[in-house]
Amino acid sequence: QVQVVTQDEREQLYTPASLKCSLQNAQEALIVTWQKKKAVSPENMVTFSENHGVVIQPAYKDKINITQLGLQNSTITFWNITLEDEGCYMCLFNTFGFGKISGTACLTVYVQPIVSLHYKFSEDHLNITCSATARPAPMVFWKVPRSGIENSTVTLSHPNGTTSVTSILHIKDPKNQVGKEVICQVLHLGTVTDFKQTVNKG
């Protein structure tokens, strides 16, 4: 049967993003409509047809355009994605003979981790804090020279859609740690990044 091929995309916040749909059919469509999926009913964003060209709905005027003007292959581009743009989008190919054939492409917005790593001595112990803020939520791990060191983790969700994960390493005998390297590992979207800290006695 006739189908539409799509691909989900993950793009960084405040960068451009494109979603593409391809109608797997011998014939082009008569009109292509892009809609944003919403809880109640989909919202029309933009249409393209030979008769009327590109027609962008007012709410999307400065946000998107159709960058591949095709009736078999259609691409919309968001100029500068925000968190509100995250979601799923439907492309509807209104074809002669087979009606509306739709595909769904989902856009996920990510924010690269911002990481801070610092330490603080107390009289009898050392706290090393590693904090990572990202979207989706990052994970924080420790690589330390010896085992048995305790850590505590706090997760905080922010209104802007990012999540902070703060992990504190509690070292009871700080003298043994002086001059040694501690590594905070941040896992985000399948990539692990090492942040190294050498403890110096202030």
Partner: antibody, heavy 117, light 107 residues
Framework: QVQLVQSGAEVKKPGASVKVSCKAS????????ILWVRQAPGQRLEWMGH????????NYNLKFKGRVTITRDTSASTAYMELSSLRSEDTAVYYC??????????WGQGTLVTVSS | DIQMTQSPSSLSASVGDRVTITCKAS??????LSWFQQKPGKAPKSLIY???RLVDGVPSRFSGSGSGTDFTLTISSLQPEDFATYYC?????????FGQGTKLEIK
């Protein structure tokens, strides 16, 4: 040159089936939809259904309640329209045509199907 | 199903006349309408598609207009070969449906 050549006239008894062929030549068969319309004596044209030869996807007028089947043989560049459980009101001229999207340009010469006891 | 109603059902005119045939859809069909000409014992011939686009090879005296529910086919100056029956076809919604036809006869 482009041609759609249909099979010859048929006389059928009520309850029987008829299969009309439409042989295409002069173009790439899978690039155009093949459609079938019919016209009973003194009546308007009636869309029966169509097929996209590329995938073999077809769409039928539900008025025919599953009595119509449209198929194709890409190796023979031929489309077929089969109508079953024939009744007298199916007496008509059956035409095949081709379209690129909504652009209809060539038609077969028509096949007269007579249903009579 | 969408009903297509043509008017008039028949029409007498002379060579050189300007003739208008109308087609009304029972609901909005956008611009998804074609016009066909048919002569006795012959297959239909496509004249106009998408309401106002002329099919290649069709004389420019034929024109189409309209959108939504009301459409017209105009022949600006009738020629002897134009006497035939004309049908409109909607293809906005399946099943696609034809009008009942307008028979154009010589006066």
């Amino acid at each position: 040159q482009v041609q759609l050549v249909q099979s010859g006239a048929e006389v059928k008894k009520p309850g029987a089936s008829v299969k009309v062929s439409c042989k295409a030549s002069g173009y790439s068969f899978t690039d155009y939809i093949i459609l079938w319309v019919r016209q009973a004596p003194g009546q308007r044209l009636e869309w029966m259904g169509h097929i996209d030869p590329y995938y073999g996807s077809s769409n039928y007028n539900l008025k025919f309640k599953g009595r119509v089947t449209i198929t194709r043989d890409t190796s023979a560049s031929t489309a077929y329209m089969e109508l079953s459980s024939l009744r007298s009101e199916d007496t008509a001229v059956y035409y095949c045509g081709r379209s690129k999207r909504d652009y209809f340009d060539y038609w077969g010469q028509g096949t007269l199907v007579t249903v009579s006891s | 199903d969408i009903q297509m109603t043509q008017s008039p059902s028949s029409l007498s005119a002379s060579v050189g006349d300007r003739v208008t045939i109308t087609c009304k859809a029972s609901q909005d069909i956008n611009s998804y309408l074609s016009w066909f000409q048919q002569k006795p014992g012959k297959a239909p011939k496509s004249l106009i598609y998408r309401a106002n686009r002329l099919v290649d090879g069709v004389p420019s005296r034929f024109s189409g207009s309209g959108s939504g529910t009301d459409f017209t086919l105009t022949i600006s100056s009738l020629q002897p070969e134009d006497f035939a029956t004309y049908y409109c076809l909607q293809y906005d919604e399946f099943p696609y449906t034809f009008g009942q036809g307008t028979k154009l006869e010589i006066k």
